[in-house]
């Protein structure tokens, strides 16, 4: 069902901002909620279209906000409409000027058919004019200027449904802008009656809930919920399930709530006044503060929830104690159950006191067949009857009824069962790519025969000639990759679709057969690539011992990093190396290899090497001297790639000493980029040179670096900036 709520904030328009918010709580509308002017109620109101926006704070809510400067265009009647499954629910409300000559006693007034009704307007402005009263925009009554009372009333001694409508009051010289509005709602039935013939007795709707004349259900005021509106919501919440929350600082203050007829409009529990901005007086609670607490045993009265009963006591006045008979209640039974064809075990669960017995619970099929429980159990609070239908089929779809009949009363809960056909793909899956150990499958799950929606999909597969069970993988995408397949093997594939609910696995769809590729051998082991000369690289590997008799060879692919130059070389399988020649000096090459038979093998990882240099190496760069102490210093540098640098030499001597008195430190690992000189003299200036060596020779230092050690007691100095790690 639809839980539609219209919040009118504020119905009396002054110069402040005012709004209408329509909330569809707890349902998903197929069509959008609409807010519009109610021309049925007031024909001659403003014609401007409303600027309806999405309420950003709620998923299913629309809003109309009028800024203060639009005050003149607001007066009138409005509606909010929600539609679901073709059924429309419309809620009506009004807005009027706070400075109107008259103000209504209430925004709406709900009465029963046949009630004695007084519709009253309070005079707030005294004028020397006749007062006039209109119904739905048509004149019905006037009061001469000298007889206009403080409370202007329309008397209906025996209210009928045709008396319902929007009543407005103003002075004759006024207009829509100065009119006051109130809406009379007349229930189609007499008090406490409902039904097409009004011959059903209403459930006692508590807390000012209103009995709906068509359904007999209670429409609960904002702040109460349940079948009889006895249950108070948590503070500042509203809606049929109390899931909506008033976001104002003072909760639902200044919110006028309008619910579907015949409820009309009221404040939320705890508030009263036309603007719902007045708190209830002590001892009163509920919507418009119309309910008196009268709590037994001195229990507290809360203006929002009523009497706050101590444990063991219940009722509106906390007047009941102990366990009492409770009408059975069917619980946990959804209105609509979707069932997959096959075995079905419906459950009826009921509470009540005394608890229903096995014999008191039945299930009636759409064709009238009465089923008795196949299994029955109960807890302290519930009786559970389990029925068995061995094979439920689509023709069994329809309204089923769970029926419970005990000494405490009878309850029937109809619920709709929709029996679904299990889904089955119409097409076999397609193999869109395959190799020797993998296959990429388009599972082709659509179109399918039967009913959706599809909850999950399984891809079943197995080798054709093996007596193996089907393996399966759960798939989420239409494209799935099967790995770890056997080479040169024929596989069968099919797809099983699973729809929601128990027993939702459909029959597997058509089978696809495919064959994986003949296998290629693994790449050679122990691959090593080293420069041999300026124009050759040497690739070596461990001897290959193939498992089959097939002829094989090693395919080597080399390509230059710098140039678009690629070559593939075939090497007989009995060899363990190949010299890659006709290369360019000082160039980087990427090499990979594989072992081929009739089928191509798997490529190895890429190996990278530079051919030897044809020029002297460049000087090391970014030379820094740091962490200088009285006897040591750290030297760091960087070298350029690609010059076949094999070692770095650091040459240092005390300044002023002979050239032959230098010390050479040769670092044979070119990946090392820093070195600590030790054993230096304190307070001594040193001349430091650093150069790189490759196959051609040494680099030429452009200038020397000076290093002066510290006195013995001093802290380390840093001549080269950055922090250096050893």
């Amino acid at each position: 069902a639809m839980d539609l709520i219209l919040i009118n904030s504020l119905p009396l328009v002054s110069d402040a901002e005012t709004s209408l918010t329509c909330i569809a709580s707890g349902w998903r509308p197929h069509e959008p909620i609409t807010i519009g002017r109610d021309f049925e109620a007031l024909m001659n109101q403003h014609q401007d279209p409303l600027e309806v926006t999405q309420d950003v704070t709620r998923e299913w809510a629309k809003k109309v906000v009028w800024k203060r400067e639009k005050a003149s265009k607001i007066n009138g009647a409005y509606f909010c409409e929600g539609r679901v499954r073709g059924e429309a629910i419309r809620i009506r409300t009004m807005k009027m000027r706070q400075q109107a000559s008259f103000l209504p006693a209430t925004l709406t007034m709900t009465v029963d058919k046949g009630d004695n009704v007084n519709i009253s307007f309070k005079k707030v402005l005294i004028k020397e004019e006749d007062a006039v009263i209109y119904k739905n925009g048509s004149f019905i009554h006037s009061v001469p200027r000298h007889e206009v009372p403080d409370i202007l009333e329309v008397h209906l001694p025996h209210a009928q449904p045709q008396d319902a409508g929007v009543y407005s009051a103003r002075y004759i010289g006024g207009n829509l802008f100065t009119s006051a509005f109130t809406r009379l709602i007349v229930r189609r039935c007499e008090a406490q009656k409902w039904g097409p013939e009004c011959n059903h007795l209403c459930t006692a709707c508590m807390n000012n809930g209103v009995c709906h004349e068509d359904t007999g259900e209670c429409i609960c005021p904002p702040g109460f919920m349940g079948r009889t509106c006895e249950k108070a919501c948590e503070l500042h919440t509203f809606g049929r399930t109390c899931k909506e929350r008033c976001s104002g600082q003072e909760g639902c203050k200044s919110y006028v709530f309008c619910l579907p007829d015949p409820y009309g409009c009221s404040c939320a529990t705890g508030w009263k006044g036309l603007q719902c901005n007045e708190a209830c007086h002590p001892g009163f609670y509920g919507p418009d503060c119309k309910l008196r607490c009268s709590c037994n045993n001195g229990e507290m009265c809360d203006r929002f929830q009523g009497c706050l009963c101590s444990p063991g006591w219940q009722g509106l006045q906390c007047e009941r104690e102990g366990i009492q008979r409770m009408t059975p209640k069917i619980v946990d039974l959804p209105d609509h159950i979707e069932v997959n064809s096959g075995k079905f075990n419906p459950i009826c669960k009921a509470s009540g006191w005394p608890l229903p017995t096995n014999e008191e619970m039945t299930l009636v099929k759409p064709d009238g067949t009465v089923l008795h429980p196949k299994d029955f159990n109960h807890t302290d609070h519930f009786s559970v009857a389990i029925f068995t239908i061995h094979r439920i089929l689509p023709p069994d779809s329809g309204v089923w009824v769970c029926s419970v009949n005990t000494v405490a009363g009878m309850v029937e809960k109809p619920f709709n069962i929709s029996v679904k056909v299990l889904p089955k793909p119409l097409n076999a899956p397609n193999v869109i790519d395959t190799g020797h150990n993998f296959a990429v499958i388009n599972i082709s799950s659509e179109p399918y025969f039967g009913d959706g929606p599809i909850k999950s999909k399984k891809l079943l597969y197995k080798p054709v000639n093996h007596y193996e069970a089907w393996q399966h993988i759960q798939v989420t995408n239409e494209i799935v990759t099967l790995n770890y397949l056997e080479p040169r093997t024929e596989y069968e594939l099919c797809v099983q679709l699973v729809r929601r609910g128990e027993g939702g696995e459909g029959h597997p769809g058509p089978v696809r057969r495919f064959t994986t590729a003949s296998i290629g051998l693994p790449p050679p082991r122990g691959l090593n690539l080293l420069p041999k000369s300026q124009t050759t690289l040497n690739l070596t590997w461990q001897p290959i011992f193939p498992s089959s008799e097939d002829d094989f060879y090693v395919e080597v692919e080399r390509r230059s990093v710098q140039k678009s130059d690629q070559q593939n070389i075939k090497v007989p399988g009995n060899l363990t190396s190949v010299l890659l020649n006709n290369l360019h000096p000082r160039e980087q090459y990427v090499v990979r290899a594989r072992v081929n038979t009739k089928a191509q093998g798997e490529w190895s990882e890429d190996l990278t090497a530079w051919t030897l240099s044809d020029i002297l190496p460049p000087q090391p760069e970014n030379i820094k001297i740091s962490n200088i102490t009285h006897s040591s210093a750290v030297i760091s540098w960087t070298i350029l790639d690609g010059y076949s640098i094999s070692s770095i030499t650091i040459r240092y001597k005390v300044q002023g000493k002979n050239e032959d008195q230098h010390v050479d430190v040769k670092i044979k690992n070119a990946t090392i980029t820093q070195y600590q000189l030790k054993g230096l003299e304190p307070e001594t200036a040193y001349q430091v040179d650093i150069f790189a060596e490759n196959n051609i020779g040494s680099s030429n230092p452009a200038f020397s670096h000076e290093l002066v050690t510290l006195p013995e007691s001093q802290a380390p100095a840093d001549l080269g900036g950055g922090k250096m790690l050893l």
């Epitope: 397609n430 790519d433 395959t434 990429v440 064959t515 590729a517």
Partner: antibody, heavy 117, light 108 residues
Framework: DVQLVESGGAVVRPGESLRLSCAAS????????MNWVRQAPGKGLEWVSR????????FYSESVKGRFTISRDNSKSTLYLQMNSLRAEDTAIYYC??????????WGLGTLVTVSS | EIVLTQSPGTLSVSPGERATLSCRAS??????LAWYQQKPGQAPRLLIY???NRATGIPDRFSGSGSGTDFSLTISRLEPEDFAVYYC??????????FGGGTKVEIK
């Protein structure tokens, strides 16, 4: 609509190289295995090479192994065939074809490669 | 490698008549066989896959049958546009994926 358009065919001398391209559109190129199939003038069809969707697996017929390299650029939805050391017997119309269940469900119109001295 | 032999090399048939083409595999290929049609100056077109399934958009006058090593393609009533070369292809054991030598269907 699935479309495959080959290009790069030319007249070359024996021993020379050539690169063919196949531009694909209308489908998720990167998940399909792709193939080159050739047809010598007046002759039948011959499968040449195949590459997996991610480029990780390649296959060649014996007649081109070691001389031809199949590759793909999924970002450009393009398939390539690098043909080195071309011979007179490589003269053919080269078709690019999409794999489905190891047969070929879509073909390009072909590009002619002539190897002649 | 699996060798496919198609026969006859050329088949002369009148429009409206039935044509049956044969394809024999040197080894078992299960049902992994496809048929293609190629008209002069055009690319091949897939007709039948998995030995007997018609590809999308192929008229029902084309039908395939067979399994294992012996396969046939039948054109129930030849239309003028059906005169072309027909190739079979196996995809059971690969690489290589192999084609038959083709059968030319010409107007009698």
């Amino acid at each position: 609509d699935v479309q495959l358009v080959e290009s790069g065919g030319a007249v070359v001398r024996p021993g020379e190289s050539l690169r063919l391209s196949c531009a694909a559109s209308g489908f998720s190129f990167d998940i399909y295995g792709m193939n080159w199939v050739r047809q010598a003038p007046g002759k039948g069809l011959e499968w040449v090479s195949r590459i997996s969707g991610n480029g990780g697996s390649t296959f060649y017929s014996e007649s081109v192994k070691g001389r031809f390299t199949i590759s793909r650029d999924n970002s450009k939805s393009t398939l390539y065939l690098q043909m080195n050391s071309l011979r007179a017997e490589d003269t053919a119309i080269y078709y690019c074809a999409r794999t489905l269940n190891n047969f070929f469900d879509y073909w390009g119109l072909g590009t002619l490669v002539t190897v002649s001295s | 490698e699996i060798v496919l032999t198609q026969s006859p090399g050329t088949l002369s048939v009148s429009p409206g008549e039935r044509a049956t083409l044969s394809c024999r595999a040197s080894q078992h290929v299960g049902g992994n066989l496809a048929w293609y049609q190629q008209k002069p100056g055009q690319a091949p077109r897939l007709l039948i896959y998995d030995a007997s399934n018609r590809a999308t958009g192929i008229p029902d006058r084309f039908s395939g049958s067979g399994s294992g090593t012996d396969f046939s393609l039948t054109i129930s009533r030849l239309e003028p546009e059906d005169f072309a070369v027909y190739y079979c292809q196996q995809y059971y054991d690969w690489p290589p994926l192999t084609f038959g030598g083709g059968t030319k269907v010409e107007i009698k």
